[in-house]
């Protein structure tokens, strides 16, 4: 008996060939021996089987001795043994219809779990193997679970269902709702305008929700809400903003915040949360602000940074075109009685300059 695997909602063609390439009488029946379709004269006739409305045959191939049955919009309950009767012989085809669906919405928040459920006919014992867009392989039986979705799980999952050495492939589009970056750091000189951007890692037709940016300044004992906003059909509107600092927010996506001035008292880290309508949980992005200040006071040239910096970052004071340098893995460096000239304060990570501030030291006579 030939085995054919089908996908729920798809179309399948069950083939039946006569030895003689000519139009002859044929019938397709189900395992109850109830007629699905057949030929009467030159006409296709339909029996009372539940399949009749969704079953058809390629009339153009009849005179070639090909009497296939096409079943549209397959259902799990269409799984059955079908019998083609032609030229006094019977050909049996076992059709097994499978369905693979995500248990919840296919738009899931980062960190949420994804469960794929296999619908299968009674008596079947299929195995399922799924591959994520990032190349992660997961195997299972009736259910496949991915406990914590990551950004890279967004995209088309390819799942292969195997039964009786036959396979059928399903493609499921999963959208992981997250920001493009989990964390970002902005490095600014004191007094500069600061731009914070929070691009999303997905696109939705209608994007509605609300968000808030909480800020923990390095110098402050507790965090505070800097801004709250609403998102309606990708349009941003500010609900509430602190007086200090007076943040500005872009009206369109991606979410964009402007801090008029980078000041040491603002240096710190923030957490932007976005709650989407009809979704449980929130999207998060951490943002850090590092502020640099270079000052000369009497005989002391000082360079300082505020905000979350890694201990491996190097802060240096360097006289332009001269070899004189002072470097430390610290948040402040200074030079006593600096030479006259243009001094550079550099914050670098393994030789890569993250932030630079120039200060001119004038000669004292």
């Amino acid at each position: 008996k030939k085995v054919v695997l089908g996908k729920k909602g798809d179309t399948v063609e069950l083939t039946c060939n006569a030895s003689q390439k000519k139009n002859t009488q044929f019938h397709w029946k189900n395992s109850n021996q109830i007629k699905i379709l057949g030929i009467q004269g030159l006409f296709l006739t339909k029996g009372p089987s539940k399949l009749s409305d969704r079953a058809d045959s390629r009339k153009s191939l009849w005179d070639q001795g090909c009497f296939s049955m096409i079943i549209k919009n397959l259902k799990i309950e269409d799984s059955d043994t079908y019998i083609c009767e032609v030229e006094n012989k019977k050909e049996e085809v076992e059709l097994l219809v499978f369905g693979l669906t995500a248990n919840s919405d296919t738009h899931l928040l980062e960190g949420q779990s994804l469960t794929l459920t296999l619908e299968s006919p009674p008596g079947s014992s299929p195995s399922v193997k799924c591959r994520s867009p990032g190349g992660k392989n997961i195997q299972g039986g009736r259910t496949i679970s991915v406990p914590q979705l990551e950004r890279q799980d967004s995209g088309t999952w390819t799942c292969t269902v195997s039964q009786d050495q036959k396979t059928v492939e399903f493609k499921i589009d999963i959208v992981v709702l997250a920001f493009q970056k989990a964390s970002s750091t902005v490095y600014k000189k004191e007094g500069e305008q600061v731009e914070f951007s929070f691009p999303l890692a997905f696109t939705l037709e209608k994007l509605t929700g609300s968000g808030e940016l909480w800020w923990q300044a390095e110098r402050a004992s507790s965090s505070k809400s800097w801004i709250t906003f609403d998102l309606k059909n990708k349009e941003v509107s500010v609900k509430r903003v602190t007086q200090d600092p007076k943040l500005q927010m872009g009206k369109k996506l991606p979410l964009h915040l402007t801090l008029p001035q980078a000041l040491p008292q603002y240096a710190g880290s923030g957490n932007l949360t976005l709650a989407l309508e009809a979704k449980t949980g929130k999207l998060h992005q951490e943002v850090n602000l590092v502020v640099m200040r270079a000052t000369q006071f009497q005989e002391n040239l000082t360079c300082e940074v505020w905000g979350p910096t890694s201990p491996k970052l190097t802060l240096s004071l360097k006289l332009e075109n001269k070899g004189a340098t002072v470097s430390k893995q610290a948040k402040a460096v200074w030079v006593l009685n600096p030479e006259a000239g243009m001094w550079q304060c550099l914050l670098s990570d393994s030789g890569q300059v993250l932030l630079e501030s120039n200060i001119k030291v004038v000669p004292t006579w």
């Epitope: 395992s31 109850n32 021996q33 109830i34 007629k35 009467q40 006739t45 339909k46 029996g47 009372p48 089987s49 539940k50 009749s52 409305d53 969704r54 259902k75």
Partner: antibody, heavy 120, light 107 residues
Framework: QVQLQESGPGLVKPSETLSLTCTVS????????WSWIRQSAGKGLEWIGR???????NYNPSLKSRVTMSVDTSKNQFSLKLNSVSAADTAVYYC??????????????WGQGTTVTVSS | DVQMTQSPSSLSASVGGRVTITCQAS??????LNWYQQKPGKAPKLLIY???NLETGVPSRFSGSGSGTDFTFTISSLQPEDFATYYC?????????FGGGTKVEIK
């Protein structure tokens, strides 16, 4: 045990629409085909058509242009509408369950029938 | 549509007698034929399916035969409760169609 009960007006004016409902009790409407059959005085039985929850209905070609069948799974009911009626549509209307099993297809459970008269 | 022609349209028979009803299809319907019994004011009841298979609970005096286009229904020994109208019905093709009926009356 499944029981069927037809309901609807016993008298319909010519050119109007005949509307009947069949209530299914003792079982789910979702797993079978349900049909309407009529029997006019002195005449035999005529299959009007059948409906299944997830498929489009099948109608008798002789009535197709005038007939509409629908299912309400929440109420466990199915219904028949026959428009532009004439005296020829006067009959006893039966609702029935269609059953498929090995080598058999037919009506295994019937309602008691409701008489519909078309007259002005 | 498959036309089903039943004959006779009516007959008179005595209790204990043998009754034969024929049904002819306008085209080959294989064995896809049911026989129903209907009593006045009641819905039809299935007696025979697939031309010759006796439905569970139906007395063995009822039988059916035939295939293709010609079918026969027989009551071997008529009982008082058998006086009714009998219908054949094909299920080879949609629409399902019935014969015109045979009324069996007491002689």
């Amino acid at each position: 045990q499944v029981q069927l009960q037809e309901s609807g007006p016993g008298l319909v004016k010519p050119s109007e629409t005949l509307s009947l409902t069949c209530t299914v009790s003792g079982g789910s409407i979702s797993t079978y085909y349900w049909s309407w059959i009529r029997q006019s005085a002195g005449k035999g039985l005529e299959w009007i058509g059948r409906i299944y929850t997830s498929e489009r209905p099948n109608y008798n070609p002789s009535l197709k242009s005038r007939v509409t069948m629908s299912v309400d799974t929440s109420k466990n009911q199915f219904s028949l509408k026959l428009n532009s009626v004439s005296a020829a549509d006067t009959a006893v209307y039966y609702c029935a369950r269609e059953l498929e099993r090995p080598y058999y297809y037919g009506m295994d459970v019937w309602g008691q029938g409701t008489t519909v008269t078309v007259s002005s | 549509d498959v036309q089903m022609t039943q004959s006779p349209s009516s007959l008179s028979a005595s209790v204990g007698g043998r009754v034969t009803i024929t049904c002819q299809a306008s085209q080959d319907i294989s064995n896809y034929l049911n026989w129903y019994q209907q009593k006045p004011g009641k819905a039809p009841k299935l007696l025979i399916y697939y031309a010759s298979n006796l439905e569970t609970g139906v007395p063995s005096r009822f039988s059916g035969s035939g295939s293709g286009t010609d079918f026969t229904f027989t009551i071997s020994s008529l009982q008082p409760e058998d006086f009714a109208t009998y219908y054949c019905q094909q299920y080879d093709n949609l629409p399902l169609t019935f014969g015109g009926g045979t009324k069996v009356e007491i002689k």
